[in-house]
Each structure stands twice: as C-alpha cells, then as structure tokens.
C-alpha cells in the first residue's frame, strides 16, 4: 500500500513469479497442425511470462505425432531467454498418426526424470496441446491414471482448427481432451477455434499454472 493507504500494483504480473515448477509441454506435431508458426508463437508468449532457471521454473518440451521426440530437457536451459531461442527453433516433425497417450506417457516416464532435470519435491506440470483425437485412445485411460499416481498436474488444450476446416463434429475430440486434464476440468481444459487463437489463452493459462504454487 502507499502512504495514503491506497492499494498500489497489488497483483504481480505472471512473469515476476519466481516460483518453483517443473513444466513439460507436450506438443502435437502431427501433419494436421497448421500453421506451425501459431504453435511457436503460443510457446513464445507462454514462455516469456516465466521466470526460468535452475532454482525457479524449469521447462522441457516433448513433441509427438506417430512417435515422440524430446525437443529439450527440463535442465537444458537456465534462463527464459535461452528457452525462448530454443523454442523458436522447434520444427514440426509431422506424423501419420496422433499418438497423444504416447506423448503423455513419454513425458511422465522420461521427461520428468531426475536424469532429464526434474527436481525432487518440485511440483510437476504438464501442458498438452493437440488438434485431433488420439490414435492410441485405448492406452489413454491408463496413462492418465499413471500421471495421477505421480501427482502430475495436467492442462490440456484442444485446437479445433482441423475439425472446423473439415466441418466435423468436435464433440468426441473435446470429450477426450477434457479427460486428459486434471480436476477441476474447467480450470485445466482449454479449447481454441484454430491454431491462430492459441495466443488468446496464454494469459489465463499462465495464471492458472502459477496459481498451483500460490
């Protein structure tokens, strides 16, 4: 408060939050994601709000399509600037299928290991971004349960672009991506009309992620 007892700047911006979180972003890079620039713009806007460092927030990125790739580990970069540069360089790897359960499971089993930089006692957060129903849905229930068992908080984002472009029903897709999100679903699930609209959820997503350590 000010000397005149006025409330001044009472809400700190997200980027000033020097909280400790291990965040792994699980990106769908299958062929139907278009344009990829929208995904990297979303990453840029989200990451620049974070205070990244070995004693602050750490970020790793996993990309999946028909298989899975670790783009970079949690402990690879020690500043927001370095992560931003690396994230801009991520190329879309494509894929004939959308293996969402595989992407999530690989993040859980591999990306969140100490060998890749995960820290003991630090909250684990996963952000899953996808534009289509998984081809490995038959594995999804178990994969989500495994994440629950390891206390991994999950935010899921459904990009409806390919469905809208093809005039397809989004109902089953939205249902599936909601099932990935942690409870309460309304605070952990987002959907956007297309890839370009990803940037519109960044502020709210960022706030909800960092509210986990409030």
């Amino acid at each position: 408060v000010s000397p005149t007892f006025q409330v001044v700047n009472s809400i700190a911006p997200v980027q000033e939050c020097s909280t400790q979180l291990d965040i792994v972003i699980v990106l769908d890079g299958s062929n139907s994601i278009y344009p990829w620039d929208s995904v990297t713009a979303f990453l840029n806007d989200l990451l620049e709000r974070m205070d990244i460092g070995p004693k602050q927030t750490q970020v790793g990125i996993v990309q999946y399509g028909e298989n899975v790739t670790h783009e970079f580990n949690l402990n690879k970069y020690s500043s927001t600037e370095e992560v931003l540069v690396a994230a801009k360089k991520i190329v879309q790897r494509g894929g004939r299928q959308t293996m969402t359960a595989l992407g999530i499971d690989t993040a859980r089993k591999e990306a969140f290991t100490e060998a890749r930089g995960a820290r003991r006692g630090v909250k684990k957060v996963m952000v899953i971004v996808t534009d289509g129903e998984s081809h490995d849905n038959h594995r999804l229930k178990q994969v989500i349960q495994d994440c629950e068992d390891e206390n991994i908080q999950r935010f899921s984002i459904a990009i409806l672009g390919s469905y809208n472009r093809g005039n397809l029903s989004t109902e089953k897709f939205v249902e599936e991506i909601k099932s990935i999100a942690s409870e309460p679903t309304e605070k952990h699930f987002f959907n956007v009309s297309d890839e370009l609209a990803l940037v519109t959820i960044v502020k709210t997503l960022g706030e909800r992620i960092f509210a986990l350590e409030a």
Epitope: E66, N67, R96, Q97, M99, L102, G132, E133, S134, H135, D136, N137, H138, R139, L140, K141, G166, L168, K172, E176
Partner: antibody, heavy 120, light 107 residues
C-alpha cells in the same frame, strides 16, 4: 478393460462367403485404426488388411492374396469391425484375429480369434 | 513389400538359458519393429514395441535392441512359461509384415 471379441467363423464351401465381426469395448473405437490378421493351421501370422478411422478417410488397405475378395468395414455407432469374405478358397482357412493398429505399437491389442474353415 | 527374416526358425533351450532371436528387414525400418509371443491356441501378445520398449506387464527378462535393418530379441534367463513361438513384425510401412516365427522348445 480394452477388449476385442471376434465372431462369425465357421465352415464354408469354396466359392462361398462369410462375414466376421469384431466387437470392441473399453476404448473409443471410432479413434482407432483396425486390422485383421490371420493364421493358417501350423503357419505364421499374415496381415489381411486395415481400415483407418472416419477422420482419416476410413480408407482400407489389403494384402495381395485377399484384394478384391475381402472387404473391411466398420460401424462406429456399434463399436464393431467387419470382414466380409467372398469367393473363399481353401487357402483362406485360418484363425482370424482383429487388432488395434498403430505404427508405433504395431498390434498391441488382439481378439481371441475366430476360426474359418473353407472345405468342400 | 518389406520382407522380415527371422532366425533361427526353431531352437531348443533349457530353463535359465539366455536366448537370442534375430530379425532382419529387407530395407531400413528405423525402429518400427515389434516382437510378439504366441502360445498354442492363444492370440499373439505384444512383448516389445519400437524395437526396445518393453510392453507394460511383460517381465524384464525380455529385451529388444537394434535399429535400421537388424534387430534382436533376448530372453536373459528362460523360464518355463517362455516356451512359445516368437514373431517379429515391422510397422514402418504398409503392408505390415511378420517374420516367419521362431519356436522356442524345451531341450
């Protein structure tokens, strides 16, 4: 529990027809690519064909020995996969399995199989 | 079509033995190679996917290795329940193709 249950096998004469069914449960069937695989008595495994999901065009692919005679279809509202077999030959005698198919895992879920015998 | 060649076609071994089965693809399939176990009268069961990943619930004595064209399935210490037929399969391209199988019998 993820489960596939085949039915419809039986004895049929050469030149005859048969339709096999595969009932799926425990997962969102409409998401999956499905395959049929067969195994002749005392022989190895042979892929028969595959159907993609509706959002991928529901396209089908077949092994050379069955192309033009066998047709794979699906009814997502009934969670059921079908194999329509026409112009059957004695060499089509086999146990027929339905499977979920992905490039990464291959065929990670199988039904128990249904036996087709083609004999005069 | 990609041809898959397994060797040996059969082998005799004792409980506790280390068993190795090889599979060769006629062209590179990266790591899109799966191994299945089949017992008489039963459906095949996935053991190893993506050349080296152990399927959930499969004992750790089973392991897979290789990339490109040459692959190996190893059973580190053969158990009585491991006597079965083993198949490799490529899922890199359509049609997916199987090896001819390796029957593991009791010595």
């Amino acid at each position: 529990e993820v489960q596939l249950v085949e039915s419809g096998g039986g004895l049929v004469k050469p030149g005859g027809s048969l339709r096999l069914s595969c009932a799926a449960s425990g997962f969102t069937f409409s998401n999956a690519w499905m395959s049929w695989v067969r195994q002749a008595p005392g022989k190895g495994l042979e892929w028969v064909g595959r159907i993609k999901r509706k959002t991928d065009g529901e396209t089908t692919d077949y092994a050379a020995p069955v192309k033009g005679r066998f047709t794979i279809s699906r009814d997502d509202s009934r969670n059921t996969l079908y194999l329509q077999m026409n112009s059957l030959k004695t060499e089509d005698t086999a146990v027929y399995y339905c499977t979920i198919y992905t490039y990464y895992y291959g065929m990670d879920v199988w039904g128990q199989g249904t036996t087709v015998t083609v004999s005069s | 079509d990609i041809q898959m060649t397994q060797s040996p076609s059969s082998l005799s071994a004792s409980v506790g033995d280390r068993v190795t089965i090889t599979c060769r693809a006629s062209q590179s399939i990266n790591n899109y190679l799966n191994w299945y176990q089949q017992k008489p009268g039963k459906a095949p069961k996935l053991l190893i996917y993506a050349a080296s990943s152990l399927e959930s619930g499969v004992p750790s004595r089973f392991s897979g290795s290789g990339s490109g064209t040459d692959f190996t399935l190893t059973i580190s210490s053969l158990q009585p329940e491991d006597f079965a037929t083993y198949y490799c399969q490529q899922s890199y391209s359509t049609p997916p193709t199987f090896g001819q199988g390796t029957k593991v019998e009791i010595k």
